[in-house]
């Protein structure tokens, strides 16, 4: 139960006080008691409940006509059952007794009022009155947790605008309102109550730039909503009529959790006594609601795909046809960014990561725009953000970034349990250097901080700086599986490729050619690849780098060897000893449910079939997956990327609600 104020009573004159329903009000009967009195009794109107405790140990008793010793150990508290119809209509009489004096009476006239700030603290999608039931001032995680949730209103419901909805002080329409969380102020007071009292709604100065509150006028159009709290306004005096009244507020978050903002916002209503014009207003009562800003959540490959994105560039029509066919099979919408909009930047995966935000009443896809800002720079803002599609970005928008700030270097695992700790939304994975040096690359700290601050997908730092491009999607992927943990981790494996090629040579296929059928590309015999000492040394180094990540992933995702599939792949070390795929990198695949779009490796053809394709199919088809090999050689591979790098996917949000987890 909420804490009310302390009321001091005195026999000299009647005391007038306000008691808010649902609060516990302390009654000080001692400090002004007549000197010779040693005991007291209390009588109250039927609407007032008086509790007297004499402790320690406390003996609690509701009032009757019994007398109590007048000493500091006696605690008297009041609660009110009903709101007053008129000012001071509830009475409490205290009678003081002494051995030699007649009883002395002190009168207290109480006005019971109902004032409660309600939000969806039970996370049901509906606002229910919570008076005297739960403490709204705390926010707790887990299935038994409580606390309201706010969405960053980061979509653009107004197609005429170039800004996010949270960047203006207006409510566009009911669509815009649905992105906000409802908070209701319920009051029930005597008619004349607000001639001497005022209600003020306020937010801490440290939080005022993170939230905006609109007041709705009931029965009017939503456009009648007016801003009452926000970056310029930490407090607002409310014009409340007496009697029974409900006032609706719509609350939007303006910022995602980050290093300097844990994501909690407290909105408070204060009841002020303004009866004495000579004196400052006095606080009578406060009620608060704590909201947590919904985190941005990534979706792993195991979530069903809903929309595929790719770029149209010079001569990639065949690639797009393959992706289109795959999207149709997976029943996905397909969005192609035309040449005139991508400015010859085909790396859709690197430009953005599509996740979502969720409150009990609303789920919203949100695109996280990377700071790489090349030709696709405008695509997330102009073509992805829109009605019910949010936008967020972090990091420097001009320079100061590295290749590791592209989002091919940002992935998320499926849900895992690690040494008893559950990660029901998976864990974020991104690449880094293994130690800082003058020329090592790392994901920009602003991006790392943002990802960590979301709390629900605790990030894991992998080692990817050994790669020329430096992205985790160059050596790992996840695919759905019907058994075990519901997925497999795929890792690029030089060892597995050498093993396969050695087996083929042993069977007399040493003359079979890698890159057969690719014009203008020097072909390589299996026997030459196997005998090339430098290439072996390079791949031995690569294997060590991938093995480092393998052990890290096993430890941080709680995986066993049987959860991992090795995909045959060779690399070569290029300038500054950075690795690139020697043939199209098959692990860099597009995963659309059970349909996989895998870079066509152009491996040695043996008995009419590419032995690399055959090997991969034999590894993945038993899991119910269908492998489509896509020719990306000249349009993507030789430009240092593959199918995954050139595509992006919006996926279905988790059915698991983020607030039910315990980070």
């Amino acid at each position: 139960m909420a804490q009310g104020t302390l009321i001091r009573v005195t026999p000299e004159q009647p005391t007038h006080a306000v008691c808010v329903l649902g609060t516990l009000t302390q009654l000080d009967i001692c400090s002004s008691a007549p000197e010779d009195c040693t005991s007291f009794s209390i009588n109250a109107s039927p609407g007032v409940v008086v509790d007297i405790a004499h402790g320690p140990p406390a003996k609690k008793k509701s009032t009757g006509s019994s007398t109590w010793p007048l000493d500091p150990g006696v605690e008297v508290t009041l609660t009110m059952k009903v709101a007053s119809g008129s000012t001071g209509d509830q009475k409490v009489q205290i009678s003081y007794y002494g051995p030699k004096t007649p009883p002395v009476k002190a009168l207290l006239y109480l006005t019971g009022v109902e004032i409660s700030l309600c939000a969806d603290i039970t996370r049901t999608g509906k606002v229910k009155p919570t008076r005297a039931v739960k403490d709204q001032r705390t926010w707790t995680w887990g299935p038994c947790g409580q606390g309201a949730i706010l969405l960053v209103n980061c979509d653009r419901d107004n197609l005429e605008s170039s800004a996010m909805d949270c960047e203006d002080d207006e409510v566009l329409d009911s669509e815009d309102l649905q992105d906000m969380s409802l908070m209701t102020l319920s009051t029930k007071t005597p008619k004349d109550f607000f001639t001497n009292h005022t209600l003020v709604l306020h937010v801490a100065r440290s939080e005022m730039d993170k939230v905006r509150v609109f007041q709705a006028t009931r029965g009017k159009l939503s456009s009648k909503c007016s801003v009452v709290l926000g970056p310029k306004w930490p407090s607002h005096y409310l014009m409340v009529p007496g009697g029974k009244h409900n006032m609706d507020f719509y609350v939007e978050a303006l910022a995602f959790p980050d290093t300097d903002f844990p994501g909690l916002i407290t909105l408070t209503i204060s009841l002020l006594d303004t009866s004495n014009l000579e004196l400052p207003e006095a606080v009578v009562f406060q009620d608060s609601v704590v909201f947590r800003v919904a985190p941005w959540i990534m979706t792993p490959n195991t979530q069903p795909p809903q929309e595929v994105y790719a770029c149209s560039i010079f001569e990639n029509e065949d690639f797009l046809k393959s992706v289109t066919t795959l999207a149709m099979k997976a029943k996905c919408k397909l969005t192609i960014c035309p040449e005139e909009e991508n400015m010859d930047d085909q790396w859709m995966q690197d430009e953005m990561e599509i996740g979502y935000i969720q409150a009990p009443h609303k789920t919203l896809p949100v695109v996280f725009d990377s700071p790489r800002n090349r030709g696709l720079k405008e695509f997330p803002i102009k073509r992805v953000m829109g009605p019910d599609f949010g936008y967020v970005t972090r990091g420097p928008q001009t320079g100061g970034i590295s290749g590791l700030d592209s989002f091919g270097n940002l992935e998320v695992s499926p849900p895992v349990t690690v040494r008893g700790k559950e990660y029901p939304l998976g864990r974020i994975l991104f690449g880094d250097s293994c130690y800082p040096s003058n020329d090592s690359r790392q994901m920009h700290q602003a991006l790392q901080d943002f990802l960590s601050a979301q709390q629900v997908q605790a990030p894991v730092k992998l080692y990817s700086d050994w790669l020329s491009v430096g992205h985790v999607d160059e050596f790992l992927s996840f695919v759905p599986a019907p058994d075990r943990k519901g997925f497999r981790l795929l890792l690029a494996s030089p060892r597995s490729c050498y093993k396969l090629f050695q087996e083929q040579q042993n069977e007399g296929h040493g003359e079979a050619l890698l890159f057969e059928g690719i014009k203008k590309k020097k072909q390589q015999k299996i026997k030459n690849i196997l005998s090339n000492k430098t290439l072996r040394e390079h791949n031995s180094f690569v294997e060590r780098c991938i093995d480092w990540n393998r052990e890290l992933l096993k430890r941080e995702l709680g995986l066993a060897e049987s959860d991992i599939i090795d995909i045959p792949q060779l690399f070569k070390l290029k300038e500054f000893s950075k690795a690139e795929a020697f043939f199209p990198n098959m692990v860099n695949m597009l995963v659309l449910g059970k349909h996989l779009g895998i870079p066509k490796p152009f491996g040695p053809v043996i008995n009419g079939r590419c032995c690399l394709e055959e090997k991969v199919c034999s590894l993945l088809e038993p899991l119910g997956l269908q492998c489509t090999f896509i020719n990306d050689f000249f349009t993507y591979h030789i430009r240092h990327g593959e199918v995954h790098c050139g595509t992006n996917v919006r996926r279905k949000p988790f059915s698991f609600k983020w607030w039910n987890m315990v980070p």
Epitope: R374, S402, G403, S406, N528, I529, L535, H538, E575, K578
Partner: antibody
């Protein structure tokens, strides 16, 4: 064969900034590793910076690290050298140079470590 | 002071052979096969004449040859010609924090 033309040099006070550009013609610069090399008046060559074709990693000489930034815009067929906090000892002719990234080599050819195409250079003078 | 050491000058008569040395350490010339040589005529940009220790770009006469032994690389020009008079610079990849090093340059005079 690609041809390179540097621009953006000039006289600048110590502590000032300049942005050098290296524009390519005759071929697509995105197929080339690019380095900047400088030569102080009457002195030898000094390697300054490097950027790879994928535009994903860069390297710098100790003498310029933290002050100079190399970048490329493949759409504009250009590479840039942003030079901040310039010092008198940065006075030199700045050459843009490149090497083709040959995808056919079975193993690394070391093409990022040598420069087979050079521009004519642009003079940067840092003086008060 | 340059990281790779070259003689300040060498000379030779037309038709003769000259060798220019380039001495580094086990962290550059001795470690990598990424040694290259450049020719620079006065007022002109340098020109690549040898890469990967001994390979010649197309158009470079076979009078120019490169080799390496231990921490020292060498450029040999046989059958000297007047137009060979120029400054010559060696370069190597290095494992130091500056990944490409140049020698101080050698002035070749054709007598």
């Amino acid at each position: 064969q690609v041809q390179l033309v540097e621009s953006g040099g000039g006289l600048v006070k110590p502590g000032g900034s300049l942005r050098l550009s290296c524009a390519a013609s005759g071929s697509t610069l995105s197929d080339y590793f690019v380095s900047w090399i400088r030569q102080a008046p009457g002195k030898g060559l000094e390697w300054v910076s490097f950027i790879n074709t994928a535009n994903t990693f860069t390297y710098y000489a100790d003498s310029v690290r933290g002050r100079f930034t190399i970048s490329r815009d493949n759409a504009k067929n250009s590479v840039y050298l942003q030079m901040n906090s310039l010092r008198a000892e940065d006075t030199a002719v700045y050459y843009c140079s490149s090497a083709n990234d040959d995808v056919d080599d079975i193993v690394a050819p070391g093409r990022g470590y040598y420069m087979d195409v050079w521009g004519r250079g642009t003079l940067v003078t840092v003086s008060s | 002071q340059s990281a790779l050491t070259q003689p300040r000058s060498v000379s030779g008569s037309p038709g003769q052979s000259v060798t220019i040395s380039c001495t580094g350490t086990s962290g550059d010339v001795g470690r990598y096969s990424h040694v290259s040589w450049y020719q620079q005529h006065p007022g002109k940009a340098p020109k690549l004449i040898i890469y990967n220790v001994y390979e010649r770009p197309s158009g470079v006469p076979d009078r120019f040859s490169g080799s390496k032994s231990g921490n020292t690389a060498s450029l040999t020009i046989s059958g000297l010609q007047a137009e060979d008079e120029a400054d010559y610079y060696c370069s190597s990849h290095s494992r130091s924090s500056t990944p490409v090093l140049f020698g101080g340059g050698t002035k070749l005079t054709v007598l």
